[in-house]
Interface confidence: low
Amino acid sequence: SAHLHPRDSCPLGPGRCCHLETVQATLEDLGWSDWVLSPRQLQLSMCVGECPHLYRSANTHALIKARLHGLQPDRVPAPCCVPSSYTPVVLMHRTDSGVSLQTYDDLVAQGCHCA
Amino acid sequence: SAHLHPRDSCPLGPGRCCHLETVQATLEDLGWSDWVLSPRQLQLSMCVGECPHLYRSANTHALIKARLHGLQPDRVPAPCCVPSSYTPVVLMHRTDSGVSLQTYDDLVAQGCHCA
């Protein structure tokens, strides 16, 4: 039977709880078209979805936060879905002398948890 | 004009944006009364408040997330207020042989940002 309270699987149904999702964005979407040359389109992995009680808790603080949110909902917010790790991505920049490649370590999420 | 760097003043008014707040909790609130002896009451620093565009952005990913949320609000969630660092706290535990002190590095938030 369905659980209202998560164990390890999402109690809300597949794809509803905190997970990694790919979002397509153009350089124009990001406001980067004047200084980034490529890629013109980025596949950005982002963390989306709900954080029901105990689901993918990041650490002790997140477990406490979930518990206190249940007891003091107007005072303590529920945990939310944020990146737990990132994967590097290389962008080609315009520079005064031409172009350069730069690695961004904190741009694309690789994993998610509830914090 | 557009901000290149994360905003530090809250555009929603004092105390409304992502900040550290102290929440009192008893061991009973946390469900810890059977295995933690002291302190009986904890002052838990937690991250609360909203994350309007560019406010205390954690990193490049958070800046992008805020931007894409503005463009695709149903697809991309707004950044949310989570701990950026923690401060250690020592709890006194019951053990089979008596009591012991244990340090928790991830229980009490020390700083907050929007991720």
Partner: antibody
Framework: QVQLQESGPGLVKPSQTLSLTCTVS??????????WTWIRQHPGKGLEWIGA???????VYNPSLKSRVTISVDTSKNQFSLKLSSVTAADTAVYYC???????????WGQGTLVTVSS | DIVMTQSPLSLPVTPGEPASISCRSS???????????LDWYLQKPGQSPQLLIY???NRASGVPDRFSGSGSGTDFTLKISRVEAEDVGVYYC?????????FGGGTKVEIK
């Protein structure tokens, strides 16, 4: 203090779709961690949980009604809605909307609206 | 679905006297996190239900301390230490451990 108010037709014909809306005031339906619920009470009887929706659109339904129920949320209007298709006289009830959190499941309720299914 | 059974069906009470309502579930409501997922509600005549007790024994905000909840696993009790006239209505227990949440049949409390 958040307030909830149900609205919709009080009379629905058999086989048609019952549609109700719950308007939330005094708080944002967008607030993470809350879920928004529909419960009904047949005349002179007990309470039956219909289903719930999180602000983002995640839903959980009562299996006994799942094939006929749709709950949706409109964050721009601060409202959530119930649609119950193929109604019969057995769906005549007072319908309540409520707000819940993890440990206090229905801590705020609307005043309820009576829906009668009759031709 | 988890079946919730309440007793008694009707409870005539005298103001100032204690009262007790029992609720039994068809399976344990004790979660591994130590909480019993059992709530109590009161529906006063002509009103919506209101939350009294959550997680078996926690009083909801604004609920007088004459109301208390106890029990664990499958057997739960709601006690009113000294009944007042405003306490009349139908009391429901409800489990929220598993979907769908289910309610007991209700106990009608009335003044003798």
């Amino acid at each position: 203090q958040v307030q909830l108010q149900e609205s919709g037709p009080g009379l629905v014909k058999p086989s048609q779709t019952l549609s109700l809306t719950c308007t939330v005031s005094g708080g944002s339906i967008n607030s993470g961690g809350y879920y928004w619920t529909w419960i009904r009470q047949h005349p002179g009887k007990g309470l039956e949980w219909i289903g719930a929706i999180y602000y983002s659109g995640s839903t959980v339904y009562n299996p006994s009604l799942k094939s006929r129920v749709t709950i949706s949320v409109d964050t721009s209007k601060n409202q959530f809605s119930l649609k119950l298709s193929s109604v019969t006289a057995a769906d005549t009830a007072v319908y309540y909307c409520a707000r819940g959190v993890e440990y206090q499941h229905f801590n705020e309720w609307g005043q309820g609206t009576l829906v009668t299914v009759s031709s | 679905d988890i079946v919730m059974t309440q007793s008694p069906l009707s409870l005539p009470v005298t103001p100032g006297e204690p009262a007790s309502i029992s609720c039994r579930s068809s399976q344990s409501l004790l979660h591994s996190n130590g909480y019993n997922y059992l709530d109590w509600y009161l529906q006063k005549p002509g009103q919506s239900p209101q939350l009294l007790i959550y997680l078996g024994s926690n009083r909801a905000s604004g609920v007088p301390d004459r109301f208390s909840g106890s029990g664990s696993g499958t057997d739960f009790t709601l006690k009113i230490s000294r009944v007042e006239a405003e306490d009349v209505g139908v009391y429901y227990c409800m489990q929220t451990l598993e979907a769908p949440p289910t309610f007991g049949g209700g106990t009608k409390v009335e003044i003798k």
